[in-house]
Protein backbone atom coordinates (compact mmCIF):
# COMPACT_ATOMS: atom_id res chain seq x y z
CA UNK A 1 0.00 0.00 0.00
CA UNK A 2 1.29 3.45 -0.90
CA UNK A 3 1.51 5.93 1.95
CA UNK A 4 -0.97 8.76 1.49
CA UNK A 5 1.58 11.49 2.12
CA UNK A 6 5.25 12.20 2.50
CA UNK A 7 7.09 11.82 5.80
CA UNK A 8 6.62 14.75 8.19
CA UNK A 9 8.97 17.67 7.84
CA UNK A 10 10.94 18.79 10.86
CA UNK A 11 12.28 22.37 10.91
CA UNK A 12 15.98 22.43 10.03
CA UNK A 13 16.10 18.68 9.45
CA UNK A 14 16.18 16.34 6.51
CA UNK A 15 15.25 12.69 6.25
CA UNK A 16 16.71 9.70 4.50
CA UNK A 17 15.69 6.12 3.87
CA UNK A 18 18.51 3.64 4.34
CA UNK A 19 16.74 1.18 2.05
CA UNK A 20 13.48 1.20 0.11
CA UNK A 21 10.68 -1.28 0.60
CA UNK A 22 9.32 -3.17 -2.39
CA UNK A 23 6.60 -1.09 -3.96
CA UNK A 24 8.45 2.20 -3.51
CA UNK A 25 8.27 4.49 -6.52
CA UNK A 26 10.99 6.90 -7.60
CA UNK A 27 9.74 9.54 -10.02
CA UNK A 28 11.67 9.85 -13.26
CA UNK A 29 12.28 13.57 -12.92
CA UNK A 30 14.64 15.53 -15.15
CA UNK A 31 16.47 18.75 -14.50
CA UNK A 32 15.41 22.00 -16.16
CA UNK A 33 15.92 21.91 -19.90
CA UNK A 34 15.40 18.15 -20.03
CA UNK A 35 12.35 15.90 -20.02
CA UNK A 36 11.49 12.21 -19.87
CA UNK A 37 11.99 10.54 -23.21
CA UNK A 38 8.82 9.92 -25.15
CA UNK A 39 7.52 6.50 -24.24
CA UNK A 40 9.81 6.50 -21.22
CA UNK A 41 8.96 5.28 -17.73
CA UNK A 42 7.11 7.57 -15.35
CA UNK A 43 8.89 6.09 -12.37
CA UNK A 44 11.22 3.36 -11.18
CA UNK A 45 9.65 0.68 -9.00
CA UNK A 46 11.32 -1.42 -6.33
CA UNK A 47 10.26 -4.99 -7.04
CA UNK A 48 11.49 -8.46 -6.26
CA UNK A 49 11.04 -11.53 -4.13
CA UNK A 50 12.20 -12.58 -0.69
CA UNK A 51 15.75 -13.20 -1.86
CA UNK A 52 16.41 -10.30 -4.23
CA UNK A 53 14.97 -6.84 -4.85
CA UNK A 54 15.82 -4.39 -7.60
CA UNK A 55 14.50 -1.34 -9.40
CA UNK A 56 12.27 -1.99 -12.40
CA UNK A 57 12.18 0.46 -15.31
CA UNK A 58 14.86 2.94 -16.25
CA UNK A 59 14.64 6.70 -16.06
CA UNK A 60 15.90 8.50 -19.13
CA UNK A 61 16.05 12.22 -19.80
CA UNK A 62 16.44 13.99 -23.11
CA UNK A 63 17.01 17.61 -23.97
CA UNK A 64 13.78 19.55 -24.31
CA UNK A 65 15.22 21.14 -27.43
CA UNK A 66 16.68 18.01 -29.06
CA UNK A 67 14.25 15.27 -29.99
CA UNK A 68 16.29 12.11 -30.38
CA UNK A 69 19.15 12.30 -27.91
CA UNK A 70 18.74 10.09 -24.89
CA UNK A 71 21.44 9.45 -22.37
CA UNK A 72 21.67 7.30 -19.31
CA UNK A 73 25.14 7.51 -17.88
CA UNK A 74 26.47 8.52 -14.50
CA UNK A 75 26.58 12.31 -14.08
CA UNK A 76 29.86 14.13 -13.63
CA UNK A 77 30.70 15.08 -10.05
CA UNK A 78 29.57 18.67 -10.50
CA UNK A 79 26.13 17.40 -11.45
CA UNK A 80 25.79 15.43 -8.23
CA UNK A 81 23.91 18.10 -6.30
CA UNK A 82 22.31 17.47 -2.96
CA UNK A 83 19.05 15.57 -3.06
CA UNK A 84 16.86 16.51 -0.15
CA UNK A 85 15.55 13.08 0.68
CA UNK A 86 18.28 10.76 -0.45
CA UNK A 87 21.86 11.88 -0.40
CA UNK A 88 22.40 13.86 2.76
CA UNK A 89 26.02 13.88 3.76
CA UNK A 90 26.90 11.78 6.74
CA UNK A 91 30.21 10.32 7.89
CA UNK A 92 28.35 7.15 8.76
CA UNK A 93 27.92 4.43 6.18
CA UNK A 94 24.26 3.42 5.76
CA UNK A 95 23.25 -0.02 6.92
CA UNK A 96 24.00 -2.81 4.47
CA UNK A 97 20.95 -2.46 2.28
CA UNK A 98 21.63 -5.70 0.45
CA UNK A 99 21.11 -7.56 3.72
CA UNK A 100 17.56 -6.27 4.13
CA UNK A 101 15.12 -8.68 2.45
CA UNK A 102 12.38 -7.03 0.46
CA UNK A 103 14.27 -3.77 0.11
CA UNK A 104 16.11 -2.00 -2.71
CA UNK A 105 19.29 -0.01 -2.34
CA UNK A 106 19.61 3.60 -3.53
CA UNK A 107 19.26 3.57 -7.34
CA UNK A 108 22.24 4.84 -9.34
CA UNK A 109 21.85 8.30 -10.83
CA UNK A 110 20.82 8.84 -14.42
CA UNK A 111 22.13 11.66 -16.58
CA UNK A 112 20.30 14.97 -16.29
CA UNK A 113 18.07 13.80 -13.47
CA UNK A 114 16.50 16.47 -11.28
CA UNK A 115 18.51 17.73 -8.34
CA UNK A 116 15.99 16.34 -5.87
CA UNK A 117 14.71 12.78 -5.91
CA UNK A 118 11.03 12.30 -5.22
CA UNK A 119 10.04 8.97 -3.70
CA UNK A 120 6.57 7.65 -2.99
CA UNK A 121 6.83 5.27 -0.07
CA UNK A 122 4.84 2.23 1.00
CA UNK A 123 3.48 1.11 4.36
CA UNK A 124 6.29 -0.12 6.60
CA UNK A 125 8.90 2.26 5.22
CA UNK A 126 11.17 3.85 7.80
CA UNK A 127 13.04 7.10 7.30
CA UNK A 128 15.69 8.63 9.54
CA UNK A 129 16.14 12.30 10.37
CA UNK A 130 19.16 14.45 11.02
CA UNK A 131 19.60 18.15 11.60
CA UNK A 132 21.01 20.21 8.76
CA UNK A 133 24.44 21.73 9.05
CA UNK A 134 24.58 24.36 11.75
CA UNK A 135 21.85 22.79 13.90
CA UNK A 136 22.12 20.39 16.81
CA UNK A 137 19.69 17.60 17.63
CA UNK A 138 17.71 17.49 20.84
CA UNK A 139 16.11 14.07 21.04
CA UNK A 140 12.91 13.30 22.89
CA UNK A 141 12.81 9.86 21.36
CA UNK A 142 13.63 8.12 18.07
CA UNK A 143 14.64 10.44 15.23
CA UNK A 144 12.75 8.32 12.76
CA UNK A 145 9.34 8.01 11.20
CA UNK A 146 7.48 4.93 10.00
CA UNK A 147 4.53 4.79 7.61
CA UNK A 148 1.81 2.76 9.32
CA UNK A 149 -1.64 1.61 8.34
CA UNK A 150 -4.32 2.38 10.93
CA UNK A 151 -8.04 1.74 10.37
CA UNK A 152 -7.50 1.56 6.62
CA UNK A 153 -5.63 4.88 6.51
CA UNK A 154 -1.91 5.43 6.28
CA UNK A 155 -0.01 7.79 8.54
CA UNK A 156 3.58 8.60 9.42
CA UNK A 157 4.68 8.49 13.02
CA UNK A 158 6.08 11.72 14.38
CA UNK A 159 9.86 11.78 14.81
CA UNK A 160 10.87 13.00 18.25
CA UNK A 161 13.54 15.42 17.10
CA UNK A 162 14.12 19.11 17.60
CA UNK A 163 16.95 20.90 15.83
CA UNK A 164 18.39 23.89 17.65
CA UNK A 165 20.54 26.58 16.12
CA UNK A 166 23.82 25.67 17.72
CA UNK A 167 26.80 25.18 15.46
CA UNK A 168 27.03 21.45 15.82
CA UNK A 169 25.73 18.79 13.47
CA UNK A 170 23.97 15.60 14.39
CA UNK A 171 24.24 12.36 12.50
CA UNK A 172 22.09 9.47 11.38
CA UNK A 173 21.14 6.72 13.83
CA UNK A 174 24.20 5.23 15.43
CA UNK A 175 26.14 8.46 15.65
CA UNK A 176 24.64 9.61 18.91
CA UNK A 177 22.42 8.02 21.49
CA UNK A 178 18.83 9.27 21.36
CA UNK A 179 17.67 10.62 24.68
CA UNK A 180 14.35 8.97 25.36
CA UNK A 181 12.16 11.23 27.45
CA UNK A 182 8.90 10.52 29.24
CA UNK A 183 7.82 14.00 28.26
CA UNK A 184 8.13 13.14 24.60
CA UNK A 185 4.99 13.82 22.63
CA UNK A 186 2.96 10.71 21.90
CA UNK A 187 2.55 10.07 18.22
CA UNK A 188 -0.81 10.98 16.76
CA UNK A 189 -3.18 8.06 16.28
CA UNK A 190 -5.57 10.01 14.10
CA UNK A 191 -3.79 10.96 10.93
CA UNK A 192 -0.58 11.57 9.08
CA UNK A 193 0.98 14.90 9.78
CA UNK A 194 0.74 17.32 6.94
CA UNK A 195 3.53 19.59 5.88
CA UNK A 196 3.81 22.78 3.92
CA UNK A 197 6.68 24.11 1.89
CA UNK A 198 7.85 26.53 4.58
CA UNK A 199 8.36 23.63 6.99
CA UNK A 200 5.57 24.65 9.34
CA UNK A 201 3.96 21.47 10.57
CA UNK A 202 0.19 21.45 10.44
CA UNK A 203 -1.82 18.85 12.26
CA UNK A 204 -5.38 19.76 11.46
CA UNK A 205 -5.59 18.85 7.79
CA UNK A 206 -6.86 15.29 7.97
CA UNK A 207 -10.45 16.28 7.35
CA UNK A 208 -9.39 18.25 4.30
CA UNK A 209 -7.80 15.15 2.83
CA UNK A 210 -11.03 13.23 3.34
CA UNK A 211 -13.08 15.38 1.02
CA UNK A 212 -11.08 17.48 -1.36
CA UNK A 213 -7.50 18.56 -1.10
CA UNK A 214 -7.87 21.23 -3.73
CA UNK A 215 -9.88 24.38 -4.06
CA UNK A 216 -10.27 25.83 -7.50
CA UNK A 217 -11.23 29.34 -8.43
CA UNK A 218 -11.02 31.53 -11.47
CA UNK A 219 -10.30 35.18 -11.96
Amino acid sequence: ELCDDDPPEIPHATFKAMAYKEGTMLNCECKRGFRRIKSGSLYMLCTGNSSHSSWDNQCQCTSSATRNTTKQVTPQPEEQKERKTTEMQSPMQPVDQASLPGHCREPPPWENEATERIYHFVVGQMVYYQCVQGYRALHRGPAESVCKMTHGKTRWTQPQLICTGEMETSQFPGEEKPQASPEGRPESETSCLVTTTDFQIQTEMAATMETSIFTTEYQ
Epitope: D5, E29, R32, K38, S64, A114, H120
Partner: antibody
Protein backbone atom coordinates in the same frame (compact mmCIF):
# COMPACT_ATOMS: atom_id res chain seq x y z
CA UNK B 1 -15.78 33.52 -26.91
CA UNK B 2 -12.31 34.88 -27.44
CA UNK B 3 -11.99 35.88 -23.80
CA UNK B 4 -9.55 34.81 -21.11
CA UNK B 5 -9.75 33.22 -17.69
CA UNK B 6 -7.24 32.07 -15.15
CA UNK B 7 -8.04 29.05 -13.01
CA UNK B 8 -6.33 28.51 -9.66
CA UNK B 9 -6.04 25.31 -7.69
CA UNK B 10 -4.95 25.64 -4.06
CA UNK B 11 -3.55 22.38 -2.71
CA UNK B 12 -3.35 21.40 0.94
CA UNK B 13 -2.77 18.28 2.96
CA UNK B 14 0.27 17.03 1.06
CA UNK B 15 3.73 18.14 -0.05
CA UNK B 16 2.68 19.91 -3.22
CA UNK B 17 6.20 20.31 -4.61
CA UNK B 18 6.65 16.51 -4.68
CA UNK B 19 3.85 15.85 -7.14
CA UNK B 20 3.20 16.22 -10.83
CA UNK B 21 -0.10 17.95 -11.47
CA UNK B 22 -2.71 17.92 -14.21
CA UNK B 23 -5.85 19.65 -15.39
CA UNK B 24 -8.73 17.48 -16.56
CA UNK B 25 -12.06 18.78 -17.83
CA UNK B 26 -15.55 17.44 -18.35
CA UNK B 27 -18.06 19.09 -20.63
CA UNK B 28 -21.67 18.98 -19.39
CA UNK B 29 -23.05 15.48 -19.83
CA UNK B 30 -19.82 14.30 -21.45
CA UNK B 31 -16.78 12.27 -20.46
CA UNK B 32 -13.44 13.23 -18.96
CA UNK B 33 -10.79 14.89 -21.13
CA UNK B 34 -7.17 15.37 -20.08
CA UNK B 35 -6.05 18.96 -20.67
CA UNK B 36 -2.53 19.57 -19.40
CA UNK B 37 0.37 18.28 -17.29
CA UNK B 38 3.15 19.98 -15.34
CA UNK B 39 6.10 18.30 -13.63
CA UNK B 40 6.79 18.80 -9.94
CA UNK B 41 9.39 21.48 -10.59
CA UNK B 42 7.41 23.08 -13.41
CA UNK B 43 10.14 22.41 -15.95
CA UNK B 44 8.17 19.99 -18.15
CA UNK B 45 4.74 20.75 -19.57
CA UNK B 46 2.38 18.98 -21.96
CA UNK B 47 -0.98 19.96 -23.46
CA UNK B 48 -3.82 18.23 -25.25
CA UNK B 49 -3.97 19.17 -28.93
CA UNK B 50 -7.36 20.79 -28.36
CA UNK B 51 -5.89 23.50 -26.10
CA UNK B 52 -2.31 23.80 -27.37
CA UNK B 53 -1.34 27.39 -28.06
CA UNK B 54 -4.31 28.75 -26.11
CA UNK B 55 -3.88 27.40 -22.57
CA UNK B 56 -0.87 27.75 -20.28
CA UNK B 57 -0.31 25.63 -17.18
CA UNK B 58 1.94 26.84 -14.37
CA UNK B 59 2.55 26.30 -10.68
CA UNK B 60 3.91 28.13 -7.66
CA UNK B 61 5.32 25.59 -5.23
CA UNK B 62 5.87 28.26 -2.59
CA UNK B 63 2.14 28.96 -2.63
CA UNK B 64 1.03 25.34 -3.12
CA UNK B 65 -0.88 26.49 -6.17
CA UNK B 66 -1.54 25.27 -9.70
CA UNK B 67 -2.81 27.56 -12.45
CA UNK B 68 -4.37 27.32 -15.88
CA UNK B 69 -4.36 30.45 -18.01
CA UNK B 70 -7.02 30.07 -20.70
CA UNK B 71 -6.95 32.43 -23.68
CA UNK B 72 -8.94 32.60 -26.91
CA UNK B 73 -11.76 30.70 -25.24
CA UNK B 74 -14.28 28.83 -27.37
CA UNK B 75 -17.75 27.53 -26.68
CA UNK B 76 -16.39 24.00 -26.67
CA UNK B 77 -14.15 24.89 -23.70
CA UNK B 78 -17.26 25.02 -21.53
CA UNK B 79 -16.71 22.34 -18.90
CA UNK B 80 -16.02 21.57 -15.29
CA UNK B 81 -12.26 21.85 -14.81
CA UNK B 82 -10.54 19.64 -12.25
CA UNK B 83 -6.99 19.81 -10.97
CA UNK B 84 -5.60 16.36 -10.25
CA UNK B 85 -2.48 15.01 -8.61
CA UNK B 86 -0.58 12.24 -10.35
CA UNK B 87 1.06 9.41 -8.46
CA UNK B 88 2.14 6.25 -10.20
CA UNK B 89 0.21 6.06 -13.44
CA UNK B 90 -3.02 7.47 -12.02
CA UNK B 91 -4.60 10.66 -10.72
CA UNK B 92 -5.07 9.89 -7.07
CA UNK B 93 -6.56 13.12 -5.73
CA UNK B 94 -8.90 15.50 -7.50
CA UNK B 95 -10.20 18.97 -6.80
CA UNK B 96 -13.91 19.54 -6.47
CA UNK B 97 -13.96 21.19 -9.89
CA UNK B 98 -15.02 24.59 -11.16
CA UNK B 99 -17.47 25.25 -13.96
CA UNK B 100 -16.27 27.43 -16.80
CA UNK B 101 -18.96 28.65 -19.15
CA UNK B 102 -18.03 30.27 -22.45
CA UNK B 103 -20.95 32.05 -24.05
CA UNK B 104 -21.75 35.19 -25.96
CA UNK C 1 -5.48 11.39 -29.56
CA UNK C 2 -8.69 9.35 -29.79
CA UNK C 3 -10.57 8.40 -26.63
CA UNK C 4 -10.26 4.83 -25.40
CA UNK C 5 -13.32 2.73 -26.20
CA UNK C 6 -15.62 1.58 -23.39
CA UNK C 7 -19.12 0.10 -23.50
CA UNK C 8 -21.72 2.78 -22.93
CA UNK C 9 -23.45 0.84 -20.19
CA UNK C 10 -23.13 -2.31 -18.11
CA UNK C 11 -25.64 -3.61 -15.61
CA UNK C 12 -25.87 -6.35 -13.03
CA UNK C 13 -27.83 -7.49 -10.02
CA UNK C 14 -26.58 -7.07 -6.45
CA UNK C 15 -23.96 -9.68 -5.64
CA UNK C 16 -23.10 -10.35 -9.26
CA UNK C 17 -19.80 -9.58 -10.97
CA UNK C 18 -19.48 -7.27 -13.95
CA UNK C 19 -16.53 -6.43 -16.18
CA UNK C 20 -15.94 -3.19 -18.05
CA UNK C 21 -13.56 -3.22 -21.00
CA UNK C 22 -11.32 -0.40 -22.21
CA UNK C 23 -9.76 -0.74 -25.63
CA UNK C 24 -6.94 1.38 -26.94
CA UNK C 25 -3.88 0.94 -29.11
CA UNK C 26 -0.24 -0.07 -28.77
CA UNK C 27 0.54 3.62 -28.26
CA UNK C 28 -1.44 3.80 -25.04
CA UNK C 29 -3.06 0.85 -23.26
CA UNK C 30 -0.96 -1.78 -25.02
CA UNK C 31 2.30 0.08 -24.66
CA UNK C 32 2.29 0.83 -20.94
CA UNK C 33 1.22 -0.54 -17.60
CA UNK C 34 -0.10 2.91 -16.72
CA UNK C 35 -3.81 2.20 -17.00
CA UNK C 36 -6.08 3.59 -14.29
CA UNK C 37 -9.78 3.45 -13.52
CA UNK C 38 -12.06 6.11 -12.00
CA UNK C 39 -15.49 6.06 -10.43
CA UNK C 40 -17.65 9.15 -10.73
CA UNK C 41 -20.98 9.69 -9.04
CA UNK C 42 -23.26 12.44 -10.43
CA UNK C 43 -22.07 15.90 -9.49
CA UNK C 44 -18.91 14.60 -7.85
CA UNK C 45 -15.23 14.56 -8.76
CA UNK C 46 -13.80 11.30 -10.09
CA UNK C 47 -12.26 8.88 -7.60
CA UNK C 48 -9.26 6.68 -8.38
CA UNK C 49 -10.18 3.00 -8.07
CA UNK C 50 -7.28 1.24 -9.82
CA UNK C 51 -3.87 2.50 -10.93
CA UNK C 52 -1.06 0.89 -12.92
CA UNK C 53 -3.43 -1.74 -14.36
CA UNK C 54 -4.16 -3.68 -11.19
CA UNK C 55 -3.17 -1.74 -8.06
CA UNK C 56 -5.79 -0.54 -5.59
CA UNK C 57 -5.26 2.66 -3.57
CA UNK C 58 -5.80 2.38 0.17
CA UNK C 59 -9.45 2.69 1.05
CA UNK C 60 -10.75 1.13 -2.17
CA UNK C 61 -12.68 -2.10 -1.71
CA UNK C 62 -11.02 -5.31 -2.85
CA UNK C 63 -14.19 -5.99 -4.83
CA UNK C 64 -12.58 -3.83 -7.51
CA UNK C 65 -9.82 -5.39 -9.59
CA UNK C 66 -8.06 -4.54 -12.81
CA UNK C 67 -6.22 -6.43 -15.52
CA UNK C 68 -4.87 -5.97 -19.03
CA UNK C 69 -4.36 -8.09 -22.12
CA UNK C 70 -2.84 -6.59 -25.23
CA UNK C 71 -4.53 -3.32 -26.07
CA UNK C 72 -7.52 -3.94 -23.79
CA UNK C 73 -7.77 -3.25 -20.07
CA UNK C 74 -10.60 -4.47 -17.85
CA UNK C 75 -12.18 -3.45 -14.57
CA UNK C 76 -14.08 -6.12 -12.66
CA UNK C 77 -16.49 -5.32 -9.86
CA UNK C 78 -17.42 -8.39 -7.86
CA UNK C 79 -20.24 -8.62 -5.34
CA UNK C 80 -21.99 -5.68 -6.97
CA UNK C 81 -23.56 -3.24 -4.51
CA UNK C 82 -26.02 -0.39 -4.88
CA UNK C 83 -23.31 2.21 -4.16
CA UNK C 84 -21.30 0.93 -7.15
CA UNK C 85 -23.84 2.53 -9.47
CA UNK C 86 -21.85 5.32 -11.14
CA UNK C 87 -19.92 6.24 -14.25
CA UNK C 88 -16.55 4.56 -14.73
CA UNK C 89 -13.68 5.85 -16.83
CA UNK C 90 -10.41 4.23 -17.81
CA UNK C 91 -7.30 6.25 -18.58
CA UNK C 92 -3.89 5.53 -20.03
CA UNK C 93 -0.56 7.24 -20.42
CA UNK C 94 0.41 7.58 -24.08
CA UNK C 95 3.52 7.54 -26.23
CA UNK C 96 3.12 11.32 -26.63
CA UNK C 97 3.66 11.75 -22.88
CA UNK C 98 0.01 12.75 -22.57
CA UNK C 99 -3.02 11.00 -21.10
CA UNK C 100 -6.19 9.76 -22.70
CA UNK C 101 -9.49 8.83 -21.05
CA UNK C 102 -12.08 6.31 -22.06
CA UNK C 103 -15.52 7.19 -23.34
CA UNK C 104 -17.07 6.21 -20.01
CA UNK C 105 -19.36 3.40 -18.89
CA UNK C 106 -22.56 3.82 -16.89
CA UNK C 107 -22.92 1.00 -14.38
CA UNK C 108 -26.47 0.22 -13.29
CA UNK C 109 -27.31 -2.02 -10.34
CA UNK C 110 -30.60 -3.70 -11.12
Amino acid sequence: PGGSLRLSCAASGFTFSSYEMNWVRQAPGKGLEWVSYISSSGSTIYYADSVKGRFTISRDNAKNSLYLQMNSLRAEDTAVYYCARRRGGGFDYWGQGTLVTVSS
Amino acid sequence: QSALTQPASVSGSPGQSITISCTGTSSDVGGYNYVSWYQQHPGKAPKLMIYDVSNRPSGVSNRFSGSKSGNTASLTISGLQAEDEADYYCSSYTSSSTYVFGTGTKVTVL
